[in-house]
Interface confidence: low
């Protein structure tokens, strides 16, 4: 019988008392085969973290800063359950640390040196750790002691709780730096008042502070937020303009063998029986013998943290950067205007080989980072381990939901002004063998299907979106008799046709021979009835253009397209017989790397783009013998996006809606994790 006990870690006598009460009350309402609580008492949160890592306890609830400590080696804990605040309909699990300024003050984030600053308090998250952590590398050296460096960075500050004797500049705007509400500029409201009164130029608070202090929209409109990309936004756009998104209070557990499902089962049942307004005798979110015991008193309930979400993703790139800067105190040598190398994310072995070749030819401008799946790459870009990659539209959607931005688009047509003219898109098509003359769009049920990969535009989102509208369920593996859709569950019938060996079978990378456009077409040639690809795939792989043995003698005339009206047409008539227009693949990156990725990629394509005529002796960025490594092989150039610089604008309303509908069928663990951070 599996042990269904969750050992909760308590950090004080009062917490231990509440834990025992929690244990006893849970026993009274949960059947004997259900989860139970045991209590472990430790002297501090750090001791609790160590105890969980050592398997002496299972769970504890932590503030964001401690979640970071818990994640660091050798602890390796992960967030499993989040407390939420507000209503069940609109649960708030995060708050946003923001920099508020007056509307007419005219400076940006990178111009804070010499300004006057208002802080909630020394060592506090939104008011000190996050802004100072993010500004850390701009502080004058020596950066230790930190208070002195901050004092020399701003021309005057109010940082309650600072030592006014040693660092008088930090108390210049609030003499004495009082560490309580006796100081009118203490805390969130105090820091905002410091700005409002004109004492300071910028206040570091949380997003709700402005709303709590200014009920009137006209008053709020006198203020703006400083964004990390050196722009400003209105105060109600805090989700798109903040210093960091910070989890409020989180239950952590071991990454391996951490009982995360059991912990959720326990807490989910606990909130049903003892949550807000549920029970008189025991209340989970109340602390009669203290404050915030085990859980925050202000919490309204729990939400399960998606399993794909590790601590880095949960805390977010900005928060992790800020805290790491403060803790480690390391900065690159004197920052210059020159861009650091762009770390390109390469999928599996083949892309890595091409990327390494690019890296060497780029002379230090490009570095390579490997991942096994596109989603792993997106996660690495999110957390700063990588910077950029080119993605199919379906993954541009996921990347966008995860906070990344498109920066350049692949263009596939030769034109005089290629780099300045992003194209409308390419066509998603359904290809069949001419010899299978009875096959139409209306009788695909029970046939064998070939897809570029799950989640990709032409190979999945468009055809499966259209199919979903017809069949109204997500069981595509029942609709087709078998197929190859790399990225499907390994035991699915949609992995049965795949050709990868061993662990590589059905993997969404080039180790699976039927992955991507060329792979899906090869799947049709060798095994399938229908392939969902792009309109250029057939001509690119027939007539001897692809020298691989399987493709060398193929003839375009042996294939036809399925039209949505139930007819069929020759391959060259794709403009009148396609499933939908698909957005071109695009390069994505983090917002903070956007300018550098744009600059370096434009340099790189001038060196190694389609103007290189001889790819046998020279490195060619857009060539890989029809394998579409790093970029599609038919890319002519990478084009500026102009104003289509968000994932919604880039993909277009229609496509975003189509993918949104298909989200009901999504198996993307990353999308689930990212929508948890930003619903």
């Amino acid at each position: 019988v599996p042990d269904k006990t969750v050992r909760w870690c308590a950090v004080s006598e009062h917490e231990a008392t509440k834990c025992q009460s929690f244990r006893d009350h849970m026993k009274s309402v949960i059947p004997s085969d259900g989860p139970s609580v045991a209590c472990v008492k430790k002297a501090s949160y750090l001791d609790c973290i160590r105890a969980i890592a050592a398997n002496e306890a299972d769970a504890v609830t932590l503030d964001a800063g401690l979640v970071y400590d818990a994640y660091l080696a050798p602890n390796n804990l992960k967030p499993v359950v989040a407390e939420f605040y507000g209503s069940k309909e609109d649960p708030q699990t995060f708050y946003y640390a923001v920099a508020v300024v007056k509307k007419d003050s005219g400076f940006q984030m990178n111009q804070l040196r010499g300004k006057k600053s208002c802080h909630t308090g020394l060592g506090r998250s939104a008011g000190w750790n996050i802004p100072i952590g993010l500004l850390y590398c701009d502080l004058p050296e020596p950066r230790k002691p930190l208070e002195k460096a901050v004092a020399n960075f701003f021309s005057g500050s109010c940082a309650p709780c600072a030592d006014g004797t040693d660092f008088p500049q930090l108390c210049q705007l609030c003499p004495g730096c009082g560490c309580s509400t006796l100081n009118q500029y203490f805390g969130y409201s105090g820091a905002f008042k410091c700005l409002k009164d004109g004492a300071g130029d910028v206040a570091f608070v949380k997003h709700s502070t402005i709303f709590e202090n200014l009920a009137n929209k006209a008053d709020r409109d006198q203020y703006e937020l400083l964004c990390l990309d050196n722009t400003r936004k209105p105060v109600d756009e805090y989700k798109d303009c903040h210093l960091a998104q910070v989890p409020s209070h989180t239950v952590v557990a071991r990454s391996m063998g951490g009982k995360e499902d059991l912990i959720w089962e326990l807490l989910n049942q606990a909130q049903e029986h003892f949550g807000k307004d549920k029970s008189k005798e025991f209340q989970l979110f109340s602390s009669p013998h203290g404050k915030d015991l085990l859980f925050k008193d202000s919490a309204h309930g729990f939400l399960k943290v998606p399993p794909r979400m590790d601590a880095k993703m949960y805390l977010g790139y900005e928060y992790v950067t800020a805290i790491r800067n403060l803790r480690e105190g390391t900065c690159p040598e004197a920052p210059t205007d020159e861009c650091k190398p762009v770390k390109w994310c390469a999928l599996s072995h083949h892309e890595r080989l091409k990327c390494d070749e690019w890296s060497v030819n780029s002379v230090g401008k490009i570095e390579c980072v490997s991942a096994e799946t596109t989603e792993d790459c997106i996660a690495k870009i999110m957390n700063g381990e990588a910077d950029a990659m080119s993605l199919d539209g379906g993954f541009v959607y996921i990347a966008g939901k995860c906070g990344l931005v498109p920066v350049l688009a692949e263009n596939y047509n030769k034109s005089d002004n290629c780099e300045d003219t992003p194209e409308a898109g390419y066509f998603a098509i359904a290809v069949v063998k001419k010899s299978a003359s009875d096959l139409t769009w209306d009788n695909l049920k029970g046939k064998k299907s070939c897809h570029t990969a799950v989640g990709r535009t032409a190979g999945w989102n468009i055809p499966m979106g259209l199919l979903y509208n017809k069949i109204n369920h997500c069981r595509f593996d029942e609709f087709f008799s078998e197929g190859c859709a790399p990225g499907s569950k390994k035991d699915s019938s949609l992995c049965k046709l795949c050709m990868g060996s061993g662990l590589n079978l059905c993997e969404p990378n080039n180790k699976e021979g039927y992955y991507g456009y060329t792979g899906a077409f090869r799947c049709l040639v060798e095994k399938g009835d229908v392939a969902f690809v792009k309109h250029q795939t057939v001509p690119q792989n027939t007539g001897g253009k692809n020298p691989d043995p399987w493709a060398k003698n193929l003839n375009e005339k042996d294939y036809e397209l399925l039209c949505l009206d139930g007819t069929r047409k020759p391959v060259e008539e794709y403009a009148n017989c396609h499933l939908a227009r698909a957005p071109n693949h695009a390069v994505v990156t983090r917002k903070d790397k956007e300018a550098c990725v744009h600059k370096i990629l434009r340099q790189q394509q001038h060196l190694f783009g389609s103007n290189v005529t001889d790819c046998s002796g020279n490195f060619c960025l857009f060539r890989s013998e029809t394998k579409d490594l790093l970029f599609r092989d038919d890319t002519v150039c990478l084009a500026k996006l102009h104003d289509r610089n968000t994932y919604e604008k880039y993909l277009g309303e229609e496509y975003v809606k189509a993918v949104g509908n298909l989200r009901k069928c999504s198996t993307s663990s990353l999308l689930e994790a990212c929508t948890f951070r930003r619903p």
Epitope: V360, N361, V363, K365, V612, G617
Partner: antibody
Framework: VQLQESGPDLVKPSQSLSLTCTVT?????????WHWIRQFPENKLEWLGY???????NYSPSLKSRFSITRDTSKNQFFLQLNSVTTEDTATYYC?????????????WGQGTTVTVSS | IELTQSPSSLAVSVGEKVTMTCKSS????????????LAWYQQKPGQSPKLLIY???TRESGVPDRFTGSGSGTDFTLTISSVKAEDLSVYYC?????????FGSGTKLEIK
């Protein structure tokens, strides 16, 4: 592979300087990057820029605005044009080829042509 | 990237061992391929420079084995194990780690 620079010995300030590099023994469109480098009278070497076999060019940031490299593939030549010259541009100008791997390490050089900027 | 060569000049007798250094303002070691993006050139009086060493330690074909390049990161050395009269030259280091490629100011080798 041989490279040979040619051009005027003397140029007046504010005029343009045009130099030619003629390559024999290898087609400049077949591969590699083809560079211009100059050496000042006090022997300091400065990289100016290159034209890639693809036709792509890249220039030293300090000279970018008044500097261009072009080519004539039919004659297997590439050219340097430096506008608005000053006495500071007095130097020996070399054309060179890099070895591609390693990139930008010049394995073939011309013998150089000395240019004096003086009124 | 700035390259500082030392000494600026030195005079040695034929047969002696010579060492000259090149210091970079930042590391030239590229982590991906573990190569140092540094070359050494020899320029004899009245001639154009000639590539001696690339990747910091790889001799160009035809270069005598008395020339050896070593070092990694920011500190590099060119050693001539037994100087010959024909080695009278200025020796330059050059980085090709980042744009623009830059050269050191040179070490002039004179024969006593």
């Amino acid at each position: 592979v041989q490279l040979q620079e040619s051009g005027p010995d003397l140029v007046k300030p504010s005029q343009s300087l045009s130099l030619t590099c003629t390559v024999t023994g290898y087609s400049i469109t077949s591969g590699y990057s083809w560079h211009w480098i100059r050496q000042f009278p006090e022997n300091k070497l400065e990289w100016l820029g290159y034209i890639h076999s693809s036709g792509a060019t890249n220039y030293s940031p300090s000279l970018k605005s008044r500097f261009s490299i072009t080519r004539d593939t039919s004659k297997n030549q590439f050219f340097l044009q430096l506008n608005s010259v000053t006495t500071e541009d007095t130097a020996t100008y070399y054309c060179a080829r890099d070895g591609y791997s390693p990139p930008y390490a010049m394995d073939y050089w011309g013998q150089g042509t000395t240019v004096t900027v003086s009124s | 990237i700035e390259l500082t060569q030392s000494p600026s000049s030195l005079a040695v007798s034929v047969g002696e061992k010579v060492t000259m250094t090149c210091k970079s303002s930042q590391s030239l070691l590229y982590s991906t391929n573990q190569k140092n993006y540094l070359a050494w050139y020899q320029q004899k009086p009245g001639q154009s420079p000639k590539l001696l060493i690339y990747w910091a330690s790889t001799r160009e074909s035809g270069v005598p084995d008395r020339f050896t390049g070593s070092g990694s990161g920011t500190d590099f050395t060119l050693t001539i194990s037994s100087v010959k009269a024909e080695d009278l030259s200025v020796y330059y280091c050059q980085q090709y780690y980042s744009y623009p490629p830059t050269f050191g100011s040179g070490t002039k080798l004179e024969i006593k």
